[in-house]
């Protein structure tokens, strides 16, 4: 906002390679747009459609990828009478190299090959224990032998010193198809490694982004307090302690003799005090006697500890 009245914008010689469909959002009042001096390769569908007042568009590029995604541009420019200052020549595919986009027949704008990499194996959401090594794998295919670069992002930030393993397997079909694989190695993971990871594979024709895979780092529960065997008399209060740490925080659950349906629970004489890590049974009865199990569970796993409650008649 604040630029909706801008009428003239010059972006000459700014190393612009592609024009995204939202590149000029908020500039609906533009009348003159100069993108000259940029080796533009692609213009996304309807990139200029919101600029209803556009009278002059300058483009001078001999780098256009004349595939199916560019098919819309020549008729749109002609329909809006904006072709006068547009010098746009195909660089790819080879069969259209050197031709003006205005002289290429519409049926020749095809996507037979896939010059821009296409993701074929997505990184997968995973859970890891603290201290373990994990890896994310991402593969892409391309029919271009143009050099490929690999990057990984964590929570939308590029990992600058990522431990990556990159390799290429070449298929020899009618033309060569390159199968690129990038592996992100995360060694001895900590909670700081938690986040959403995404691979970015880029060549001369553009970048492809994988899905985001979440890494959750867990710690198995471990007891900080365990229940002890106790002997008490009927009508008194039984007190059993149990607490555990872990990541995520473990949930504590109690069972008696392997089941959750026991007298103290049914009769609402069972009370759990989360802040005190204490399990109470009030007004103890003879049939409350048995083995009580405290189970601490989180997504990493579970642990149990037992205590025997012996009840004596008063």
């Amino acid at each position: 906002s604040g630029l909706d009245s801008l009428s003239k914008l010059t972006l000459f010689g700014n190393k612009i390679k592609s024009v995204a469909k939202r590149a000029f959002s908020g500039l609906e009042g533009l009348e003159h747009l100069n993108l000259g001096g940029n080796a533009i390769r692609s213009v996304q569908f309807d990139a200029f459609v919101k600029m209803k007042n556009l009278k002059e568009l300058h483009i001078s590029s001999d780098s256009f990828l004349c595939d199916c995604q560019l098919k819309w541009l020549p008729p749109w420019l002609i329909g809006r009478m904006l072709q006068a200052f547009v010098t746009a020549t195909c660089a790819h595919p080879e069969s259209l190299k050197g031709q003006s986009i205005f002289s290429v027949p519409p049926e020749s704008f095809v996507c037979d090959d896939f010059l821009k990499p296409q993701i074929i194996t997505q990184p997968e959401t995973t859970m890891a224990m603290v201290g373990k090594d994990i890896r994310f794998t991402c593969s892409a295919a391309s029919s271009s032998s143009s050099p490929m670069t690999f990057a990984w992002k964590k929570d939308n930030e590029v990992l600058t010193n990522a431990d990556m393993e990159n390799f290429v397997h070449v298929h020899a079909q009618d033309g060569e198809v390159m199968e690129y694989t990038t592996i992100l190695h995360l060694r001895q993971v900590t909670f700081g490694h938690e986040g959403r990871y995404q691979c970015v594979i880029t060549n001369h024709f553009g970048s492809t982004y994988s899905h985001k895979a979440r890494l959750t780092v867990n710690v198995l529960p471990s007891f900080t307090k365990t229940p002890h065997d106790i002997t008490i008399r009927t009508t008194t209060v039984a007190r059993l302690e149990c607490a555990a740490t872990g990541h995520p925080n473990p949930q504590i659950a109690w069972q008696k003799d392997g089941g959750t349906d026991f007298p103290a629970a049914r009769e609402r004489r069972m009370h759990v005090m989360p802040d005190d890590d204490v399990f109470f049974i009030t007004d103890v009865k003879i049939d409350d006697a048995g083995v009580y199990s405290c189970t601490a569970q989180n997504s990493a796993g579970s642990i149990s500890a037992n205590a025997t409650l012996t009840v004596l008649e008063t």
Partner: antibody, heavy 127, light 112 residues
Framework: EVQLLESGGGLVQPGGSLRLSCAAS????????MSWVRQAPGKGLEWVSV????????YYADSVKGRFTISRDNSKNTLYLQMNSLRAEDTAVYYC????????????????????WGQGTLVTVSS | QLVLTQPPSVSAAPGQRVSISCSGS????????VSWYQQVPGSAPKLLIY???KRPSGIPDRFSASKSGTSATLGITGLQTGDEADYYC????????????FGGGTKLTVLR
């Protein structure tokens, strides 16, 4: 001299385990994908497994999937094959082989060929 | 059963030319490069050809190979007695993750 030397073969009972090693020398081990290939007595070559140059990717023949594990220690220039739940049909000479790889600017290009082979180690699975 | 089909045996006299075929499908040979190996009895295999038609250093140009569609062919000219061996073709089956496959092997006999 570029060399691969396998070890760890021997006689093992069905259901048993064995770990093969392949010591590499004379080349930058961490720049090459590596493979295991076996040959049963009097039979042809059978591909077993391959591992990428950094160890991040591993692939297996269906006949050994879930039973065999390929790994590598680039600091020791050594390739391994852990073989569990061995069967009589796993009896073979096991070769380790180097996949032609061309590494440039952090990317390794894997060719189809395996250009360096070890002398093989015999694994016999029998009761 | 074997994915790549080779003739079990071929034979020719010294000095002659011999061809060994390797037949597959669109998912293996049709989609990937082919390599060829020579194995003398009692020895480890040796790479002769990789990436359809490339020779490693040290392999004489008497050995050549070609690929057309779903078939590949190894050619040996000026046959020598030392060429008597088993020959195997190999390729990837589908993508990298599907793994590598070998042909059943062809025994080359050099007639004396």
């Amino acid at each position: 001299e570029v060399q691969l030397l396998e070890s760890g073969g021997g006689l093992v009972q069905p259901g048993g385990s064995l770990r093969l090693s392949c010591a590499a020398s004379g080349f930058t081990f961490s720049n090459y994908a590596m493979s295991w290939v076996r040959q049963a007595p009097g039979k042809g070559l059978e591909w077993v497994s391959v591992i990428s140059h950094g160890g991040g990717s591993t692939y297996y023949a269906d006949s050994v999937k879930g039973r065999f594990t390929i790994s590598r220690d680039n600091s020791k220039n050594t390739l391994y094959l852990q073989m569990n739940s061995l069967r009589a049909e796993d009896t073979a000479v096991y070769y380790c082989a180097r996949v032609i790889s061309n590494c440039h600017l952090g990317v390794c290009y894997y060719s189809n060929g395996m250009d360096v082979w070890g002398q093989g180690t015999l694994v016999t699975v029998s009761s | 059963q074997l994915v790549l089909t080779q003739p079990p045996s071929v034979s020719a006299a010294p000095g002659q030319r011999v061809s060994i075929s390797c037949s597959g499908s669109s998912s293996n040979i049709g989609d990937n490069y082919v390599s060829w190996y020579q194995q003398v009895p009692g020895s480890a295999p040796k790479l002769l050809i990789y990436d359809n038609n490339k020779r490693p250093s040290g392999i004489p140009d008497r050995f050549s190979a070609s690929k057309s569609g779903t078939s590949a062919t190894l050619g040996i000219t000026g046959l020598q007695t030392g060429d008597e061996a088993d020959y195997y073709c190999a390729t990837w089956d589908g993508s990298l993750s599907a793994g590598r496959v070998f042909g059943g092997g062809t025994k080359l006999t050099v007639l004396r």
